[in-house]
């Protein structure tokens, strides 16, 4: 089959890293620097991606594969193939149009990217709050009150969740 195909189309003999030159009797010409063809039989080479500005090179372009970019420190990738770089925020913050903002009370973000998410509502699972939530951490749910042994029933219930950094009144 391969032989039949090459008789029909001389370009099928051109390997990755070359292009089939229609203007030169379909000879295989190497891709010029900073371009590539990742499959055989191509009539063009693709221009290599250039990782500039906030992008940095994770993998150099070769004659058979494109460059790969990631983001400079303080930024993270978004989109397929790291098509965009977005600013990092601190844990306990989210990125808004006006920059990094602290998570509102009752929400948290434990990463440098993404949005603040509501604390888990322990009572929905019939559980109680074992450790209060903060801007950076979700609440930790404990066993449901019914699960507590009779001897442990005198344990002081957890204080209501409050904004971290605030002293108890």
């Amino acid at each position: 089959f391969e032989r039949t195909r090459s008789l029909q189309d001389p370009c099928s003999n051109c390997p990755a890293g070359t292009f089939c030159d229609n203007n030169r009797n379909q000879i295989c010409s190497p891709c010029p620097p900073n371009s590539f063809s990742s499959a055989g039989g191509q009539r063009t080479c693709d221009i290599c991606r250039q990782c500039k500005g906030v992008f940095r090179t994770r993998k150099e372009c070769s004659s058979t594969s494109n460059a790969e970019c990631d983001c400079t420190p303080g930024f993270h990738c978004l989109g397929a193939g790291c098509s965009m770089c977005e600013q990092d925020c601190k844990q306990g913050q989210e990125l808004t149009k006006k920059g990094c903002k602290d998570c509102c009370f009752g929400t948290f973000n434990d990463q440098k990217r993404g949005i603040c998410r509501p604390w888990t509502n322990c009572s929905l699972d019939g559980k109680s709050v074992l450790v209060n939530g903060t801007k950076e951490r979700d609440v930790v749910c404990g066993p449901s009150p019914a699960d507590l042994s009779p001897g442990a029933s005198s344990v002081t219930p957890p204080a209501p969740a409050r904004e971290p950094g605030h002293s108890p009144q």
Epitope: F19, D21, N22, N23, C31, P32, P33, N34, S35, R43, T44, C45, D46, I47, Q50
Partner: nanobody, 120 residues
């Protein structure tokens, strides 16, 4: 918005020379191959050549009479045409693409063109 503006066309006698320029605004040529096409009245569009990364590829009609070069500092690409013939009369278009050569591809962007007339 990317804009490509060609200039340098005009009337020239057979055997004469012209240098066409293509300037880009809104984006640099850094990431693109730059090509030239031409279209004569009542004829199909014809591939002239493509420039990328120090290499040039040309259509099969030009017989070393045409040379594409690039000045990165001016963000401009040139088409030097020597020993012009009446059959070179056409509108010449500058185009950019992420493909090299552009002989078989539809460009990503193309200018409005500049008229070249070769006549005595």
């Amino acid at each position: 918005e990317v804009q490509l503006v060609e200039s340098g066309g005009g009337l020239v006698q057979p055997g004469g020379s012209l240098r066409l320029s293509c300037a880009a605004s809104g984006r640099t040529f850094d990431n693109y191959a730059v090509g030239w096409f031409r279209q004569a009245p009542g004829k199909e569009r014809e591939y002239v050549g493509t420039y990328w990364s120090g290499y040039a590829h040309y259509g099969d009609f030009e017989n070393n009479r045409f040379t594409i070069s690039r000045d990165n500092s001016k963000n401009t690409v040139y088409l030097q045409m020597n020993n012009l013939r009446p059959e070179d009369t056409a509108v010449y278009y500058c185009a950019i693409s992420l493909k090299y050569p552009m002989a078989t591809v539809t460009p990503d962007y193309q200018g409005q063109g500049t008229q070249v007339t070769v006549s005595s």
